[in-house]
Interface confidence: low
Amino acid sequence: FERTRSLQDPCSNCPAGTFCDNNRNQICSPCPPNSFSSAGGQRTCDICRQCKGVFRTRKECSSTSNAECDCTPGFHCLGAGCSMCEQDCKQGQELTKKGCKDCCFGTFNDQKRGICRPWTNCSLDGKSVLVNGTKERDVVCGPSPADLSPGASSVTPPAPAREPGHSPQ
């Protein structure tokens, strides 16, 4: 099978880290500096990604794998393979077009990234608020008075977060 495949594509035998530099040349040449091929059978090597500016190098480029970037302190990755760096905000804030803004009342954000989310509505689950929410933390729901029987747990974890949505400005 392998021999047949090579007859159809003379370059199929070139391993990762090399390229087949001519149509019928079945000799594999190594990728030049600052380039890579992560799979076999490549006719060219790809240029290594350069982590510049707000990006910093998390993993150096090799002949068989691209460089990987992350973001400098104060920024976080967005997109596949950290294609963008977005500014961090403090907990209790979200990033808007005008910069970091505090979460509106009734919403929270417990991370340095993402948007403010509404507090959990304990009453939807027949619970009562045990601990009030803040800009940085969701409310903690407790059992309804009817549930307060001997042996019953006094605290339950917060309900799963609702679908994220932008809080009113």
Epitope: R3, G17, N22, Q26
Partner: antibody, heavy 116, light 107 residues
Framework: QVQLVQSGSELKKPGASVKVSCKAS????????MHWVRQAPGQGLEWMGW????????TYADDFKGRFVFSLDTSVSTAYLQISSLKAEDTAVYYC?????????WGQGTLVTVSS | DIQLTQSPSFLSASVGDRVTITCKAS??????VAWYQQKPGKAPKLLIY???IRHTGVPSRFSGSGSGTEFTLTISSLQPEDFATYYC?????????FGGGTKVEIK
């Protein structure tokens, strides 16, 4: 079956030229590149270069640039090696070899002797 | 160019012996190594390609192994017809280069 048949031995004087032929059979000639290898008396194998049998484009090793020419006649499935301005140090057996992953089929070799 | 160093250069052995020839490359050549057998007055014959794959019709007593910079050709039980010179060759970069050869002689 795959066969590469080379032309016979040659005795040449210094300064002359020689043309070695390599006729292929048993496969589609233009599907595989053809490589040339030199072996001086009592010595090892030395890669000279190769020719793209589809396009006719030759590639020469550094030591074989200038006096050595690879060519083809695809109508008769034949590759050629021409050496001009022969020198005594060109005395060697010259092999053609089909290339698929490696030099998988070789001609029987052509002895070129350069002597005054 | 990539240098290939074969060892030993000469090897005396008897029929039935297990014979091992090594080939060291001056830099990483992945698995892009072939082994050839050449008898006096004859053209080389391909034995092994891609470091370990036997060419069509090559007896199973011949085997190849290795990757990176170190490769081995092993003849598990030497036969009378195996007395010859063996060459390794890399095809990882242009120009492809050959080792200096290992001559296997009858002890």
């Amino acid at each position: 079956q795959v066969q590469l048949v080379q032309s016979g031995s040659e005795l040449k004087k210094p300064g002359a030229s020689v043309k070695v032929s390599c006729k292929a059979s048993g496969y589609t000639f233009t599907d595989y590149s053809m490589h040339w290898v030199r072996q001086a008396p009592g010595q090892g194998l030395e890669w000279m270069g190769w020719i793209n049998t589809e396009t006719g484009e030759p590639t020469y090793a550094d030591d074989f640039k200038g006096r050595f020419v690879f060519s083809l006649d695809t109508s008769v499935s034949t590759a050629y090696l021409q050496i001009s301005s022969l020198k005594a140090e060109d005395t060697a057996v010259y092999y053609c070899a089909r290339y698929d992953y490696a030099m998988d089929y070789w001609g029987q070799g052509t002895l070129v002797t350069v002597s005054s | 160019d990539i240098q290939l160093t074969q060892s030993p250069s000469f090897l005396s052995a008897s029929v039935g012996d297990r014979v091992t020839i090594t080939c060291k490359a001056s830099q990483d050549v992945s698995s892009a190594v072939a082994w050839y057998q050449q008898k006096p007055g004859k053209a080389p014959k391909l034995l092994i390609y891609w470091a370990s794959i036997r060419h069509t019709g090559v007896p199973s007593r011949f085997s190849g192994s290795g990757s990176g910079t170190e490769f081995t050709l092993t003849i598990s039980s030497l036969q009378p017809e195996d007395f010859a010179t063996y060459y390794c060759q890399q095809r990882y970069t242009t120009p492809p280069t050959f080792g200096g050869g290992t001559k296997v002689e009858i002890k």
